[in-house]
């Protein structure tokens, strides 16, 4: 299987919520002795391999927001944890996984990253991320709402959480 | 602040089998993302991979040990077992247990026991 | 099996000095390395996960590089209490395997 970002680049106002997706494509197995772990947390552009560097997402740690399911099954964290920091991980069964962040501040940009594994009894693990940016804005060159920019040379798109 | 304890026998003979208990504290052994490992030690040596075992049941041993290596867990007493039979003096080491989060390193070690083969 | 070499062996050094490791994969492993510190009698300690990234609590004096086969563990000023003896670990694949160790000592 591959992840794939949907947009490469997310650029907000603040106090607006955002939901960054990854997209999980290609054969998933959903036998018995397989399961899926998928999380979140934010990084840095290392100048050898992105994504290598894991910090916590508002003081919640990688295993504070990780999902834990076989397949394409539906998760999402709903700890309170998680949400008393403004945040919820969520997979669905299209293998669409995201983080809403909500009331975003100036602190919240940077560089966020999704980490899918397959764990698969007696196997080593298989390994996928996906990296997307994220732009806090505030002033008149803030947008009015998030907009969302493709990591193709597709068109913006304005998304805003719900 | 999460704690891994190991106990055993400190000597086992030769042919016979090693058993050790991992005791976990500040912590759930169940937690979900999270490998158990053992890792050993022979005196004035380095460190070799026993093998591991994931929160949800699945295990991973070290090839050179497979046929003689089981670890297994009690989720009741918090606890991560170790089973290596039909020991030879080449055994000898110390004996770490050790946890390991989804892909990364271990990062949280037992103070480890020596165990020691003799007749 | 995937086979890691450091080097040195064992090396010498005096408080101050700045200090390299090196660490060899037998195959690519990424960036699926660690590095450890270990004093006698003691659990190793985790300073470095993914090549390159400090643990948590770790003073920023150790630092790592590297991708694929070759890495390096740098200690940019050697301090009384960094003489151990230091393994890289590979984390890539089963079955996961250690280095030999490098021992530094005080010159």
């Known amino acids: 299987f591959k992840v794939a970002t949907l947009y490469s680049l997310y650029v907000c106002p603040e106090g607006q919520n955002v939901t960054l997706t990854c997209r999980v494509f290609g054969p998933v197995d959903k036998g018995h002795d397989v399961t899926f772990y998928k999380t979140w947390y934010r990084s840095s552009r290392g100048e050898v391999q992105t994504c290598s560097e894991r910090r916590p997402i508002r003081n919640l740690t990688f295993q504070d927001l990780h999902l834990h399911h076989g397949g394409h099954q539906a998760a999402n964290t709903s700890h309170d944890l998680a949400q008393r920091h403004g945040l919820e991980s969520a997979s669905d069964h299209h293998g669409n996984f995201s983080i809403t962040m909500r009331n975003l501040t100036l602190l919240d940009s940077g560089l966020y990253c999704c980490l899918v594994v397959e764990i698969r009894h007696h196997h080593s693990e298989h390994r996928v991320h996906g990296a997307m940016e994220l732009q806090v804005q505030t002033g008149k060159d803030a947008p009015s709402s998030c907009v969302a920019y493709p990591s193709s040379s597709q068109e913006s798109e304005n998304i805003t959480a719900a | 602040q999460l704690q891994l304890q190991e106990s055993g026998p400190g000597l086992v003979k030769p042919s016979e089998t090693l058993s050790l208990t991992c005791t976990v504290s500040?912590?759930?052994?169940?937690?979900?993302?999270?490998?158990w490992g053992w890792i050993r030690q022979p005196p004035g040596k380095g460190l070799e991979w026993i093998g591991s075992?994931?929160?949800?049941?699945?295990?991973y041993y070290n090839p050179s040990l497979k046929s003689r290596v089981t670890i297994s867990v009690d989720t009741s007493k918090n606890q991560c077992s170790l089973k290596l039979n039909s020991v030879t003096t080449a055994d000898t080491a110390v004996y770490y247990c050790a946890r390991h989060p989804v892909a990364m390193n271990f990062d949280d070690w037992g103070q480890g026991t020596l165990v020691t083969v003799s007749s | 099996d995937i086979q890691m070499t450091q080097s040195p062996s064992s090396l010498s050094a005096s408080v101050g000095d700045r200090v390299t490791i090196t660490c060899r994969a037998s195959q690519g492993i990424s960036s699926w390395l660690a590095w450890y510190q270990q004093k006698p009698e003691k659990a190793p300690k985790s300073l470095i996960y993914a090549a390159s990234s400090l643990q948590s609590g770790v003073p920023s004096r150790f630092s790592g590089s590297g991708s694929g086969t070759d890495f390096t563990l740098t200690i940019s000023s050697l301090q009384p209490e960094d003489f151990a003896t230091y393994y890289c670990q590979q984390y890539n694949s089963y079955p996961y395997t250690f280095g030999q160790g490098t021992k530094l000592e005080i010159k």
């Open positions: 075992l994931y929160s949800s049941g699945y295990t």
């Open positions: 500040g912590g759930s052994i169940s937690s979900s993302g999270y490998y």
